[in-house]
Structures are given as C-alpha cells and as structure tokens.
C-alpha cells in the first residue's frame, strides 16, 4: 500500500505502466492495478475471460473490505448474502433469503416469522388488548328511561396489533341485552309524537302484548291490550338479566 | 454452533518450546482467517499472530516474530501455534479467535506459563 | 502501532445508572472500532461493530458512537449481568491494537 512497495514491485513487473490510472500505486497494461494507494481497496473485476485489477474507495455490493499489512482487498460475502461486515456478519441478504442473526436464511427458524419489507426473521407478535371498559348505559333507540328491553355495550382497546403469524384480536366490542331503568322519561326526551309512532311489529318469540312505550307509561289510564300486570314484569326482568346475550365484533 | 477448543498450554522454563493447538468445529473453518489472541494475569488482550484462510500469508506483532509460528490444516479444521524461545512476558492466556476485522468467536484459552 | 487509550480504567456504579466509557485512537481510524465485554475466566465477547453496529442478541440498552480519534461505549441503564471488563480495539490498521480495558464495578 506504500509507496517503497509500489516502487519495488515496479522494478519486478516487466509490463508496468508508469501512468496508472485513478487510485492505483502500480498497474500494467494487460492486468490493470496490481496494488493501490493507501486506504483504497484492491478487487478484481472480470472482463469477459480477463481478470482487472482496480482499486477502489469502498468495495462493491457483496464484499466487504479487509486491510491486511501487506494489501487492503475486497473479500467475497458469503453467496447468500448481499451486504456484510463480514463473512460472520450479514447485514442485508440476497432476494429470496431472510436475514437473522447475521446469517441468510431461506426459512425463518420455529417462532420467527418472515418480514417480506426488511426481508428479516422477525418475533412473532400476538395481539394484546386492554381490559374492558364498564359497560354503557342501558338505551332503547337512544333512550335511557322508559320501562323496556334496550341494550348496553362495553368496548376494549387493542394495545399491540399482531403480526402475520401472531393470535388474532379477541372482540373489542360486546353488547348484551338489559333493561332500561324504570324512570319516567322528561319531557326532553320523549320520542316521536303519538301519531308518527307505529306500533312495532313484536320480535320473534315475543309477547303479542308488547312492552309499553314510553308515552303509553307516562299516561296515568292503561290501555287493556297494552297493560301487562306487575308480576309478568317481575317475570320478564328476571328472564332479561339471564338472557344477557352477547354480540362480538372480531378484528 | 462454533465451537473454539486450545489445548497446550502448561508450564514451561524460559528458552523452551510449546505448542499450542486450537480445534475448530462448526463452521467452515478454511473460509476463515485465524488468530491467536493473548492475555496476560490482570492485563489487557494483545494480538500475537493471523494467518489468512488458506495458509498463504501469515502476520505477526513484532515481540513474537522471528519466535512464534501460526500455521493450519483445513483437512483437520485446525490452528496451531509454535512458540519458540520463550521469555517470561510471553506468559498468558492464549486463546484463538476468528479474525475477519473483528474477532468474532474465540476458544475459553489455554494458560501458558513461562518460569524458571 | 496505533494505540488505544481507554478511560476510566475502573468504575463503579449502580444497577439502573447510564454508564459512558470513551476509548481514544492515537491516530485516525475511521469508523473501524469495535467493543468487546469479558466476564472474569470467561474469553471476550464482541459487542458492538463499525463504531455503532450492534452484534445480534446484544441489548439495545448498549450503544456506540464517536468517529475518527474518539469514540464512547454507552450503557443506557446497568443491569446486573453489565459488569464485567469492557475493551475497545480497532481494525483500521496491523497489528490490530485493543484498549487497555475498563472494569465496571457494582458501587
């Protein structure tokens, strides 16, 4: 790399130029740079059948650059590997190979998994949610009062969303059915005016004397086909809290 | 998994020859440059001598040329270290390592001791 | 030869403190240093590579940085199994030349 050996190895070689080209310490006319300046790295380039020495600031895409005491030279990564510090040391593969722990892979070893954007083995990351917020106010179509079967909701949040290979998110979202409070509903919150109100067909497997509405609670008279007496509704709260049935959302 | 083993060590009179030997296992050990690495009671790590992956060109520090010679055989995945007319100072741990830049695996080292 | 001077030589602290070690080159040597940890009886341990490149499977709590002559090993919070003797060595130049080496002590 010094000039004392450019100079020694320029009396030894018949067919050294004396005008080398950029970086070289001595060339020749058929090989090219035979050794370098200080601090460049020595690599051979094939041209064709011929092999040309040139030297260079850093070595090319999948060799890595060694000083020795007698040449700084450019050395092979392993054939897998795109860009190493190295032969121990990978830093980033060739396509088709997945990087860990310094190594080229075709497969990720058992609980890694496959980054197709790092093109890295990667921990697998299961998903992680919070715990459940309290449940929501018990509401029929907005409401809160009245005396009817509505439902309440509670949410929960996800944390850590996993990756390809980790645990689903359980559902963030539940809801079960409950009973609105037996209050009076304020004049705010009445519903639509008796006229626009139509009676609702009753659900499946449901009473034909449906739930009185609001309106019809407020009213001190009791419309007969309406009224249901006091112990069919202790009947039907208790049946509404042992039917709390749950609807999940999945994400 | 690579695997680094010295053997060799000992105690040895000033003036008197050891060789040391390090097998090597898991990994391709002739696409590998070599090293022997020492250290000395309560002292810092010293670079002794490497010789590249193919036996071709060797290096040394300047206390140990002309002394200690690094030498290999690929066929039986082995490093070797000759060492001749040793001093007092050449007292240590050596151990042998990877050299590739850094040294990235090394043997657990094998004590020598030089003493009258 | 290009001497590596390490300091401090020894130190002491705590488990959870944030621990610099500086390590000086006699001359420029680039980006070309690395560290190495070395528990008592054990063989060293490379750490950290090309200044800041971490080795795989070594805590991110270990960095590196620094460039040319002057170059710091820093551990961002010690943990128990931390101490142990921590030598820089560079590989710009032969003969390859290590720190004299820096104790990290339990206080």
């Known amino acids: 790399q010094n000039a004392s050996r450019g100079r020694r190895q320029r009396r030894m070689h018949p067919n050294v130029s004396q005008g080398c080209q950029g970086g070289c310490a001595t060339c020749s006319d058929y090989n090219g740079c035979l050794s370098c300046k200080p601090r460049l790295f020595f690599a051979l380039e094939r041209i064709g059948m011929k092999q040309i020495g040139v030297c260079l600031s850093s070595c090319p895409s999948g060799y890595y650059g060694t000083r020795y005491p007698d040449i700084n030279k450019c050395t092979k990564c392993k054939a897998d590997c795109d860009t190493c510090f190295n032969k121990n040391f990978c830093t980033k593969c060739k396509s088709g190979f997945y990087l860990h722990l310094g190594k080229c892979l075709d497969n990720c070893p058992e609980g890694l998994e496959a980054n197709n954007h790092t093109m890295e083995c990667v921990s697998i990351v299961h998903c992680e949610v919070s715990e459940w917020n309290p449940w929501s106010p018990c509401t029929k179509k907005g409401k809160t009062c009245g005396f009817k079967r509505g439902t309440e909701t509670r949410v929960r949040e996800i944390i850590q969303h996993p990756s390809a290979k980790g645990n689903l998110c359980p559902p963030t979202n539940e809801t079960r059915k409950c009973t609105v409070q037996r209050k009076k509903c304020q004049k705010g919150e009445r519903g639509k005016k008796g006229r626009e109100r139509k009676r609702k067909k009753p659900n499946k497997g449901e009473s034909k004397e449906a739930i009185p509405d609001s309106k019809s609670l407020e009213s001190s008279k009791e419309i007969p086909e309406q009224r249901e007496n006091k112990q069919q509704q202790k009947k039907r709260k208790v049946q509404d809290k042992q039917k709390s049935v749950s609807v999940s959302t999945v994400h | 998994e690579v695997q680094l083993v010295e053997s060799g060590g000992g105690v040895v009179q000033p003036g008197r020859s050891l060789r040391l030997s390090c097998a090597a296992s898991?990994?391709?050990?002739?696409?590998?440059?070599m090293a022997w690495v020492r250290q000395a009671p309560g002292k810092g790590l010293e670079w002794v001598a490497t010789?590249?992956?193919?036996?071709?060109?060797?290096y040394y520090r300047d206390s140990v040329k002309g002394r200690f010679t690094i030498s290999r055989d690929n066929s039986k995945n082995t490093l070797y270290l000759q060492m001749n007319s040793l001093r007092a100072e050449d007292t240590a741990v050596y151990y042998c390592?990877?050299?590739?830049?850094?040294?990235?695996?090394w043997g657990q080292g094998t004590m020598v001791t030089v003493s009258s | 030869d290009i001497q590596m001077t390490q300091s401090p030589s020894s130190l002491s602290a705590s488990v959870g403190d944030r621990v610099t070690i500086t390590c000086r080159a006699s001359?420029?040597?680039?980006?070309?240093l690395a560290w190495y940890q070395q528990k008592p009886g054990k063989a060293p341990k490379l750490l950290i590579y090309?200044?800041?490149s971490l080795i795989h499977g070594v805590p991110s709590r270990f960095s590196g940085s620094g460039s040319g002559t002057d170059f710091t090993l820093t551990i961002s919070s010690l943990q128990p199994e931390d101490f142990a003797t921590y030598f820089c060595?560079?590989?710009?130049?032969?003969?390859?030349?290590f720190g004299q080496g820096t104790k990290l002590e339990i206080k």
């Open positions: 898991g990994f391709t050990f002739s696409d590998y440059d």
């Open positions: 010789i590249i992956y193919d036996g071709s060109r060797t």
């Open positions: 390592a990877t050299h590739d830049k850094t040294f990235d695996y």
């Open positions: 090309d200044v800041n």
């Open positions: 060595q560079q590989y710009d130049n032969y003969p390859n030349t």
């Open positions: 001359e420029d040597i680039y980006s070309d």
